[in-house]
């Protein structure tokens, strides 16, 4: 089955940030700011035409 | 530290798994200066399709 889309699972650590409970709640400012920065960063990295976007962002304690 | 996990979507055939990881790794210095994010322990793998009911790219 060819969907025309390739999906990649990506995981990384942000070592200069501390995990706290607000990163478990998508309505908090901390969650939304970090999600926005990460989304913006990936648009910068994968500027070429094939990048469609990202989804399923999850934050966990390191 | 914070562990970030996410799914990236690309048009099929436009990038391989090696370049997904390489391009991300090459951006780490800029991520630190632009977003104040110190990134380490990058791991990339392909996702078998269908992998999730909530797999929209957006």
């Amino acid at each position: 089955l060819s969907t025309g889309v390739s999906f990649f699972f990506l995981s990384f650590h942000i070592s200069n940030l501390q995990f706290n409970s607000s990163l478990e709640d998508p309505s908090t400012d901390y969650y939304q700011e970090l999600q926005r920065d990460i989304s913006e960063m990936f648009l910068q990295i994968y500027k070429q035409g094939g990048f469609l976007g990202l989804s399923n962002i999850k934050f966990r304690p390191g | 530290s914070v562990v970030v996990q996410l799914t990236l979507a690309f048009r099929e055939g436009t990038i391989n798994v090696h370049d997904v990881e390489t391009q991300f790794n090459q951006y780490k210095t800029e991520a630190a200066s632009r977003y104040n994010l110190t990134i380490s322990d990058v791991s990339v793998s392909d996702v078998p399709f269908p992998f999730s009911a909530q797999s929209g790219a957006g």
Epitope: Q48, G49 | T14, I15, N16, V17, T22, Q26, D46
Partner: antibody, heavy 120, light 107 residues
Framework: QVQLVQSGAEVKKPGASVKVSCKAS????????MHWIKQAPGQGLEWIGY????????HYNQKFKDKATLTADKSASTAYMELSSLRSEDTAVYYC?????????????WGQGTLVTVSS | DIQMTQSPSSLSASVGDRVTITCRAS??????LVWYQQKPGKSPKLLVY???TLTDGVPSRFSGSGSGTQYSLTISSLQPEDVATYYC?????????FGSGTKLEIK
């Protein structure tokens, strides 16, 4: 037209080093990745690694990381591969090959090959 | 590392025959599969990329197919000039491994 012209054959003694060059012409050198491939006599092809001449980023096959060093001279549009601590099993034809541009996952142009012979 | 298993290692066929060479990857390489032709004493030449896209100037008797871990190169009507060794290559992940080659001869 695109051309990759490699340096001539070399005969070296065990323990010595050799530097093979690959002169590119007919395209913008810094926008295409250059790979290196080994072919031992009568054998198949083995990928050594690549260099991105624009950024000098290199990636090696683990098998060759202590054997090969890849560099590039932008001003001369030339890629180099240095092989160190040569042994008889390093005797082979070595090819440079250009990877196609964006979303092009193949080697579209190859050098003519450089035969490196290691013999005492 | 992804291993590429190519078969057969050698093949003898007659002019006009339909010939198929297969390549099996040890993991899913998502159609990032390339075929090269190498004639004796020459550099390899690109034939097919993305598993099935024929490069410019390659005769239409050549075709590539497959997906996932199984791929093949077919010559629909073998010609004398097709005598060569054929290699597949994984371009999904490093190291970008090659198959061991198929030496094609004319009967």
């Amino acid at each position: 037209q695109v051309q990759l012209v490699q340096s001539g054959a070399e005969v070296k003694k065990p323990g010595a080093s050799v530097k093979v060059s690959c002169k590119a012409s007919g395209y913008t050198f810094t926008t295409y990745t250059m790979h290196w491939i080994k072919q031992a006599p009568g054998q198949g092809l083995e990928w050594i690694g690549y260099i991105n001449p624009g950024s000098d980023y290199t990636h090696y096959n683990q098998k060759f990381k202590d054997k090969a060093t890849l560099t590039a001279d932008k001003s001369a549009s030339t890629a180099y591969m240095e092989l160190s601590s040569l042994r008889s099993e390093d005797t082979a034809v070595y090819y440079c090959a250009r990877q196609g541009n964006y979303a092009a996952y193949y080697f579209d142009y190859w050098g003519q090959g450089t035969l490196v012979t290691v013999s005492s | 590392d992804i291993q590429m298993t190519q078969s057969p290692s050698s093949l003898s066929a007659s002019v006009g025959d339909r010939v198929t060479i297969t390549c099996r990857a040890s993991g899913n390489i998502h159609n990032f599969l390339v075929w090269y032709q190498q004639k004796p004493g020459k550099s390899p030449k690109l034939l097919v990329y993305n598993a099935k896209t024929l490069t410019d100037g390659v005769p239409s008797r050549f075709s590539g197919s497959g997906s996932g871990t199984q791929y093949s190169l077919t010559i629909s009507s073998l010609q004398p000039e097709d005598v060569a060794t054929y290699y597949c290559q994984n371009f999904w992940n490093v190291p970008f491994t090659f198959g061991s080659g198929t030496k094609l001869e004319i009967k």
